[in-house]
Structure formats: C-alpha cells, structure tokens
C-alpha cells in the first residue's frame, strides 16, 4: 500500500517517501525504486538553509556599498550573508536592504540610545536641570553647572538648550 504521509525530513512523490536534501544541498533527482534522493552541494555564493527539495540554491544577499551596506557575517552554503550598515548609518528595515544616516538629536534633546547598525538614534528631551546646545548623534543631555559648588551664584537661569550662567556673589556691605 503506497504511503500517504512521510516521516520528518522526507517528502512524498510518485507514491514514495524520498529523503529531503540537507541544508547546503539542492535536489537533483527524486528517489526512485532503485536510488536514494540525489542531492548536490550549493555553489559558491549560494545557500539553502533548510532540509529541502529545491532544484536551485538561493543567491547570497549582496551588501551593496553604494547603499551604505557592508558584510557583517559572510554567508555559507547553509546560511545567507548578513549585511549591516557602515559607521554612522543604520538599516531602514529588518532585512537591511539599505541604510540611512543616523539621526542627530537637536539642541534641547540628548541621546537616550546611541544608534547601531540596525537601529536609529533615540533622542529624549532634556529634563529640567539638563541641557544640550548641540545637534549630535552621541551627546547626552548634560547637567546644568552647579554654581553653588564653585561658590558662585546663578546669574542666568539654564534652559533645555543652555547652561546656567554663574557669577560672583554680591558681597553685602556692613
């Protein structure tokens, strides 16, 4: 009685259960009454990452430097190439098919999380007591200068974009 279902890593064809090709190999010929499944290794720059019955291997992803991409991990016969972005850039999607320049945090905002090859800069508004006076992809919000510790007084209040201005204390005359 011909099988209607096959074991794991097998497939049903012509009323027979044939072994799938292992990762890194493609199908040449289905198994027959006389032979096991015939598989061949994927070529250079090709891969298959699952047990399969594919007659063609997939091409490794190309990390196009014109799109700001570079190779993070070279592909093998069983894995695809992983691309990432050049320094200062990050991927536009999970598949990392192109890159955009890291965003800078405007004055009044500081860097909460520095960008990586796959994620953009995360900015946060500088809370009271902190400021940022530059547009930067690295600078956090800095605390206002503490005039007191310098034996000075605040002459001009700080904002989220400016530091306080300290000055000498007015001496009280007797």
């Amino acid at each position: 009685e011909p099988p209607t279902a096959c074991r794991e890593k097998q497939y049903l064809i012509n009323s027979q259960c044939c072994s799938l090709c292992q990762p890194g190999q493609k199908l040449v010929s289905d198994c027959t009454e006389f032979t096991e499944t015939e598989c061949l290794p994927c070529g250079e720059s090709e891969f298959l990452d699952t047990w399969n019955r594919e007659t063609h291997c997939h091409q490794h992803k190309y990390c196009d430097p014109n799109l700001g991409l570079r190779v993070q991990q070279k592909g093998t016969s069983e894995t695809d190439t992983i691309c990432t972005c050049e320094e200062g850039w990050h991927c536009t999607s999970e598949a990392c098919e192109s890159c955009v320049l890291h965003r800078s945090c405007s004055p009044g905002f500081g860097v909460k999380q520095i960008a990586t090859g796959v994620s953009d800069t995360i900015c946060e508004p500088c809370p009271v007591g902190f400021f940022s006076n530059v547009s930067s992809a690295f600078e956090k919000c800095h605390p206002w200068t503490s005039c007191e510790t310098k034996d000075l007084v605040v002459q001009q209040a700080g904002t989220n974009k400016t530091d306080v201005v300290c000055g000498p204390q007015d001496r009280l005359r007797a």
Epitope: V28, S29, T32, E33, F34, T35, E36, E38, L40
Partner: antibody, heavy 113, light 112 residues
C-alpha cells in the same frame, strides 16, 4: 512518453574502441540517471556503469580502466566508450533509466576481425 | 565488489505449482537510510529484462500478484504461487544499494 534508444556500430575489430550513444526522449538527463547493462549471447546481465543526473559517474570494478560514460544534456544523449575490445565484449548493450522499467531495445555489438 | 548468488541455476516446475528462487548477497543490502535495494527481473526468451519486484517486496505496476518477494539483510526470495506458461524465462536478482550495482547469475525457469 519515456524512450531510450541505443545506436552502435554493430561490428568492431579487436583492440579498437567501442562507441555507443543512448538517445532519450520524454525526460531530461539533468533530472534522471541512466545506466548501462550488457549481456553476452546466452549469458547473464552485467551492470557496466552509470551517469547520475548531477553529472557524476560510477563504473563496474572490472571495466573501470577502459570505460568512459558521458552525457550531453542539450542533445539528450548518454555515451558509452570502451577501449581495448576483445571477443569477450561481444554482447547486447542496453541503456536503462534508473526508475520504473525503462530499457532501450538494446544494440548488438560483435567484436571480430 | 558485492556478489549476488542465485539458486537454483535451473528450475523445472509443473504448471500451476509454486516456485521459489533464492538470492544471497555477500554483504547486507540495507542502505544507510534504511532502504533495501534488492530487485527481481524476468527476461523472457528474445526480450529485454522486465522488472517484477523492487525494494525486496514491492510489485511493479502490472505485475500479477502471484509474484511476491521477501527477505532482508543478505537473504532474499522470489516466490511464484502458481506457475503459468508465460512465466518461463530467466529470473535475475539485482542490487542497487552499493556501487557498483550488480546482478545475480540468473535462474532459468522451465515447464516440466
């Protein structure tokens, strides 16, 4: 439908090289394997060698040194070449597909001077 | 090279009677993937061989159910439950587990 047809020289002189072509139709040689069998008059079947779909070859231990099997997928042909023939190589030569029951009609090759 | 030894060499049988042919291998025919590639052919006089049984016990399409195959490892048997006149010819066992593939020497079945 699936067909295999051998074409050979019929008569070959001792010490010469035999060339037989198996022309197939109804399937692609890149996806199916073909092997060769011969049968001397009044004797049994002898497996000679095969051409796998992927292009690799296997040969009988006793014939390996003088046998070459090749294919031209675009022409749907598998070729057998055997050197240094003797009278013992007189036989019907068959090409066979490695699934089902697809045999050529066979071609008789006589080695004689 | 793997040897397949068939017995008997000649088998005279009365029509309607059963017949049995043995095929012994010089090593196990079980493949690494668990398949056993032992097959049986019939070659009628003046014809090409015809596949009867593949992988020990599977009847090829169009083969009458009076033919059956059995065995494992190194010992295999072809049985004909009731011999008919059209069964006359030479029976060959064949293996395709190990390269080079091989045929047995043949068993000639004739009617008594």
């Amino acid at each position: 439908q699936v067909q295999l047809q051998e074409s050979g020289p019929g008569l070959v002189k001792p010490s010469e090289t035999l060339s037989i072509t198996c022309t197939v139709s109804g399937f692609s040689l890149s996806r199916y394997s073909v092997y060769w069998v011969r049968q001397p008059p009044g004797k049994g079947l002898e497996w000679m060698g095969m051409m796998w779909g992927g292009g690799s070859t296997d040969y009988s231990t006793s014939l390996k040194s003088r046998l070459t099997i090749s294919k031209d997928t675009s022409k749907s042909q598998v070729s057998l070449k055997m050197s240094s023939l003797t009278a013992a190589d007189t036989a019907v030569y068959y090409c066979v597909r490695t699934d089902g029951d697809y045999w050529g009609q066979g071609t008789l090759v006589t080695v004689s001077s | 090279e793997l040897q397949l030894t068939q017995s008997p060499l000649s088998l005279p049988v009365t029509l309607g009677q059963p017949a049995s042919i043995s095929c012994r291998s010089s090593q196990s025919l079980a493949s690494s993937q668990g398949n056993t590639y032992l097959h049986w052919y019939l070659q009628r006089p003046g014809q090409s061989p015809r596949l009867l049984i593949y992988k020990v016990s599977n009847r090829f399409s169009g083969v009458p159910d009076r033919f059956s195959g059995s065995g494992s490892g190194t010992d295999f048997t072809l049985k004909i439950s009731r011999v008919e006149a059209e069964d006359v010819g030479v029976y060959y066992c064949s293996q395709s587990t190990h390269v080079p593939w091989t045929f047995g020497g043949g068993t000639k079945l004739e009617i008594k």
